[in-house]
Interface confidence: medium
């Protein structure tokens, strides 16, 4: 049975040129987790593997950076990046959970964070 | 059924170069990282190299470092081990065998190939 | 390359419970645990076990897989005679950034 939840950053906007740190931490399981998956849309942007580390999808080498922790960070912001982002946990024994976060990217500074939300 | 079958061994003299293949089916080889995992006759295992589904990490064991370098035709459902200034030492069955899957990071090390002889002799 | 620790050879009578076990350090099987792989002579190695408990399909459960600290052990429960084999445990070392095998263990069905 899945009892974990993710926790993530939840409704999010920054400004464009900026970055932003996309963030979900899963809780309440004691499951091991084997790798954190990081999509936008259906494109792989990133691989936390829990053996070999950070691997980064070449398309996005420039403007993503791991960390901190599982998280990943956003850089150079364009309103391209609005969007939908995806953490997905792989874990064993439970299985995959997947946290949401919404971006949305600004052209002037009134961006502001919204509230952290959980997923079942 | 995942099916993994090595080729390139046989005889060679020392600091002379071979190339083993392993030639991949029955699964999506360009998802799966990749091992070269070796066995001296009658010795244990001994990692070798382990690559990345997109070659874009890539590590070696410090016997071969330098020596050996480990690649990938994800077209040819394929993995290479160019192995350069062999040695005595480098005698054994290299064997493939599957890595990580990409979308889960499960089963390392979960199917094998049955391995190709490379012996290092004058 | 340092390799993980086991004992060179195991020797248990029909039906009873082997321990094998895997001693390594916090870098490798205390950081992520280890996989074990069984080997009959002449054929190529069979995963049994991944990060520590984790079978793979098809896996007999009369083996088991667990860590304590920097050692970890195998299980193998009322053992039969193709249980006689070589076993090897391995692990991710992330000082070495490589994969690290033990020696193997012979285990002997009597």
């Known amino acids: 049975m899945m009892t974990g939840t993710i926790e993530t950053t939840g409704n999010i906007s920054a400004e464009k040129g900026g970055s932003i740190i996309l963030q979900c931490h899963l809780s309440s399981t004691t499951a091991q987790v084997t790798q954190v998956n990081w999509e936008q849309q259906d494109q792989l942007l990133a691989i936390c593997n829990a053996d070999l580390g950070w691997h980064i999808s070449p398309s996005f080498k420039d403007r993503v950076a791991p960390g901190p922790g599982l998280g990943l960070t956003l850089q150079s912001l364009t309103v391209n990046d609005t969007g939908e982002y995806f953490c997905i946990y792989h874990t064993y024994p439970d299985g995959t959970y997947t946290g949401r976060i919404f971006l949305e990217v600004l052209e002037s500074s009134v961006a502001e964070h919204g509230a952290r939300f959980q997923i079942p | 059924q995942v099916q993994l079958v090595e080729s390139g061994g046989g005889v060679v003299q020392p600091g002379r170069s071979l190339r083993l293949s392993c030639a991949a089916s029955?699964?999506?080889?360009?998802?799966?990282?990749m091992h070269w995992v070796r066995q001296a006759p009658g010795k244990g295992l001994e990692w070798v190299a382990l690559i990345w589904f997109d070659e874009s990490n890539i590590y070696y064991a410090d016997s071969v470092k330098g020596r050996f370098t480990i690649s990938r035709d994800n077209s040819k459902n394929t993995l290479y081990l160019q192995m350069n200034s062999l040695r005595a030492e480098d005698t054994a069955v290299y064997f493939c065998a599957r890595g990580y899957d990409l979308l889960t990071g499960y089963y390392n090390f979960d199917f094998w190939g049955l391995g190709t002889l490379v012996t290092v002799s004058a | 390359q340092a390799g993980l620790t086991q004992p060179p050879s195991v020797s248990k009578g029909l039906r009873q419970t082997a321990t094998l076990t895997c001693t390594g350090n916090s870098n490798n099987v205390g950081n992520r645990g280890a996989a074990w792989l069984q080997q009959h002579q002449g054929h190529p190695p069979k995963l049994l076990s991944y990060r520590n408990n984790n079978r793979p399909s098809g896996i007999s459960e009369r083996l088991s897989a667990s860590r304590s600290g920097n050692t970890a052990s195998l299980t193998i429960t009322g053992l039969q005679p193709e249980d006689e084999a070589d076993y090897y445990c391995s692990a991710w070392d992330s000082s070495l950034s490589a994969w690290v095998f033990g020696g193997g263990t012979k285990l002997t069905v009597l």
């Open positions: 029955g699964f999506t080889f360009s998802s799966y990282g």
